[in-house]
């Protein structure tokens, strides 16, 4: 596949990764739908560093991440180990909360007004960020 | 100038097979997520397939999904949509379709003159 | 899937009047909205996105109006051209989804 060495129009370049930061809301299905499509995924955050750069970006605006548990466990969209990676939860969150009175409990991280995460129903309209990985090779079709 | 022409439509029985092609030209084909859409006769358009530039992900509409698959050809600027298990329902004038190239931005800047698939014993 | 109606389904007016169409969705869209203008046998052409922005070389007597779940386009005053079908799609939601089209005929 190509390579992409430089980010495109209108993303911002950080730490070897092309990042894209939404002015409008959507699901986080939808959100992660318009990633995939320009070959990017949901923000996957992975150090205290990426945080505040995402956090710096975003403002005190509820915005969605590409983490989630809509399968059971807590998964990062690009395979990173939950377990052990980044988090930055706020206190008593996750906690799948099922008093919104929308059905189901929670399963869809979001940055929060002070950047730490919590989780909440997936089909809020909540702005999103996309990521992108410079220097790696693009991916290609799977072969049928 | 943005040129998109599709091919490879025609009459097929129910549950056969078809390969469209759409050969693109006058943009950079490799940094545009594209798309095919459909018109029945006498009806409305309605999405069928994406796939972002490179490829490597790709969306389907339910009525389709499991017997289309949408591929792209970047070397050779050609956006493709192999369809099987056909049933008289897919009868319509398929569009191949570039997307507007922003985020978030699901519209449609540029359209083929499409290739009208007919499924009929 | 997010629902698009269109009304009406024709519009009849003579040329050089105002002609205005509708598009509602069964749930907010919020200003994910595009129109189209499709002439018998042609591919459709994009007019307007993101509700009211007029898409490039699209004259200034097309406008486009609305969020949420109520759009209006608005064709100030009619060309031979603008007999055709108008198609209003979404793009908040996948899938995208497009209303089934008005026909503006020749009074």
């Known amino acids: 596949g190509s390579e992409r060495t430089c980010c495109p129009v209108n993303w911002v370049e950080h730490e070897r990764s092309c990042y894209w930061f939404s002015r409008s809301g959507k699901a986080w299905a939808d959100a992660d739908n318009y990633c995939r499509l320009e070959d990017a995924h949901l923000v996957v955050v992975t150090s205290w560093e990426e945080q505040k750069f995402v956090q710096h970006h975003i403002g005190p605006v509820n915005t969605w991440m590409g983490l989630h548990d809509q399968n059971g466990p807590w998964k990062w969209v690009d395979g990173t180990d939950y377990e052990t990676g980044f988090k930055n939860w706020r206190p008593e969150q996750p906690d799948d909360w099922y008093g919104h009175g929308l059905g189901g409990g929670e399963d869809c991280a979001h940055f929060t007004d002070d950047g730490r995460w919590n989780d909440d129903v997936c089909q809020r309209p909540y702005r999103w960020v996309c990521e992108t990985e410079l220097d790696k090779a693009s991916q290609e079709p799977p072969l049928l | 100038e943005v040129q998109l022409l599709e091919s490879g439509g025609g009459l097929v029985q129910p549950g056969g097979s078809l390969r469209l092609s759409c050969a693109a030209s006058?943009?950079?084909?490799?940094?545009?997520?594209m798309s095919w859409v459909r018109q029945a006769p006498g009806k409305g358009l309605e999405w069928v397939s994406a796939?972002?530039?490179?490829?490597?992900?790709?969306f389907y509409a339910d009525s389709v999904k499991g017997r289309f698959t949408i591929s792209r050809d970047n070397s050779k600027n050609t956006l493709f949509l192999q369809m099987n298990s056909l049933r008289a329902e897919d009868t319509a004038v398929y569009y191949c379709?570039?997307?507007?190239?922003?985020?978030?931005?699901?519209?449609?800047?540029?359209w083929g003159q499409g290739t009208l698939v007919t499924v009929s014993s | 899937e997010i629902v698009m109606t269109q009304s009406p389904a024709t519009l009849s007016v003579s040329p050089g009047e105002r002609a205005t169409l509708s598009c509602r969705a069964s749930q907010s869209v919020s200003s994910s909205l595009a129109w189209y203008r499709q002439k018998p046998g042609q591919a459709p052409r994009l007019l307007i996105y993101g509700a009211s922005t007029r898409a490039t070389g699209i004259p200034a007597r097309f406008s486009g109006s609305g969020s949420g779940t109520e759009f209006t386009l608005t064709i100030s005053s009619l060309q031979s051209e603008d007999f055709a079908v108008y198609c209003c799609?979404?793009?908040?939601?996948?899938?995208?989804?497009f209303g089934p089209g008005t026909k503006i005929d020749i009074k």
């Open positions: 006058g943009f950079t084909f490799s940094s545009y997520a």
């Open positions: 379709a570039k997307f507007f190239g922003i985020v978030g931005a699901g519209y449609f800047d540029y």
């Open positions: 799609q979404q793009y908040n939601n996948w899938p995208f989804t």
């Open positions: 796939i972002s530039g490179s490829g490597g992900n790709t």
